[in-house]
């Protein structure tokens, strides 16, 4: 696999992550955080190694920023578990809250 295909996957993966975070903010649905974290990582990792790498880099950066702003350790662990769940190819719908609109 070429470096360029890795970069392409990383770019697409970053876009998947952005879309998931953007949907999460738009939905503003209680209990949906883990679903969106898992979905973003799942979609990105499906792109290939570059996508999985981008997902990891983005989630790590996000965690560090949130930790800096005092995001709770318990929430952080739950988010990390959901990130890893999606990245490992497990179904993000496992975390889907009842009634979340189908567009998400």
């Amino acid at each position: 696999r070429s470096f360029f295909s890795f970069l392409g996957e990383a770019f697409d993966g970053a876009r998947d992550m952005w879309r998931a975070y953007s949907d999460m903010r738009e939905a503003n649905y209680i209990g949906s955080d883990k679903y969106f974290h898992a979905r973003g990582n799942y979609d990105a990792a499906k792109r290939g190694p570059g996508g999985a790498w981008a997902a990891e880099v983005i989630t790590d950066a996000r965690e560090n920023i949130q930790r800096f702003f005092g995001h709770g350790a318990e929430d952080s662990l739950a988010d990390q578990a959901a990130n890893e769940w999606g990245r490992s190819g497990k179904d993000p719908n496992h975390f889907r809250p009842a009634g979340l609109p189908e567009k998400y």
Epitope: Y29, I30, N93, G99
Partner: antibody
């Protein structure tokens, strides 16, 4: 203690609709989703869908979209399921079951007593 | 949709015997499986969730095991009240689906 009380048996004509209810008590109603399950001789147990009691929004099994509509009344801690355009295939026992959280994926520790719906001309 | 297949469909046993019911998922559901018992004319009752966690108030003669696609429910030293139907259910993705059922009868 947690209790789910369902409405009584219904005998209905083909083509009409029926609305059955399930009242939750002994817990904080909006903390747990409420699911509906169909039991018929032909298909054993089938998951129909679930209503998020916090928001009042429902998620359905694709198979029951257009057939079942779930609603709730927070003030009385009651959920409702309306079944439309009934046919003999809809004759079954319908159970409400409390979810383990507000997520779709759940096991069911608490069940209503069931509502028998019979569709007959 | 994930298909859940139980075997056997029916089973005859005597009080005091040990029986095992199996449930196969059409795809990997990890450990997200529940087991229920249902007696004639009654609602199902939760026995096990997460494949092996015993629900509150369930006697220790019941035990669940398995992961991935193969699961089993074992009942040690059958009691008269254990006869009835048993169902598995996955709680992994959507839609939730139940097994085909196993009827446990007194021999």
């Amino acid at each position: 203690q947690v209790q789910l009380q369902q409405s009584g048996a219904e005998l209905v004509r083909p083509g009409v609709s029926v609305k059955i209810s399930c009242k939750g008590s002994g817990y904080t109603f909006t903390d747990y989703a409420m699911h509906w399950v169909k039991q018929s001789h032909a298909k054993s147990l089938e998951w129909i869908g679930v209503i998020n009691t916090y928001y009042g929004d429902a998620s359905y099994n694709q198979k029951f979209k257009g057939k079942a509509t779930m609603t709730e009344d927070k003030s009385s801690s009651t959920v409702y399921m309306e079944l439309a355009r009934l046919t003999s295939e809809d004759s079954a026992i319908y159970y409400c079951a409390r979810g383990s959280s507000l997520m779709i994926t759940s096991w069911f520790a608490y069940w209503g007593q069931g509502t028998l719906v019979t569709v007959s001309a | 949709d994930i298909q859940m297949t139980q075997s056997p469909a029916s089973l005859s046993a005597s009080v005091g015997e040990t029986v095992t019911i199996t449930c196969r998922a059409s795809e990997n559901i990890y450990s997200y499986l529940a087991w229920y018992q249902q007696k004639q004319g009654k609602s199902p009752q939760l026995l096990v969730y997460n494949a092996k966690t015993l629900a509150e108030g369930v006697p220790s003669r019941f035990s669940g095991s398995g992961s991935g696609t193969q699961f089993s429910l074992k009942i040690n030293s059958l009691q008269p009240e254990d006869f009835g139907s048993y169902y598995c259910q996955h709680h992994y993705g959507t839609p939730l689906t139940f097994g085909t059922g196993t009827k446990l009868e007194l021999k």
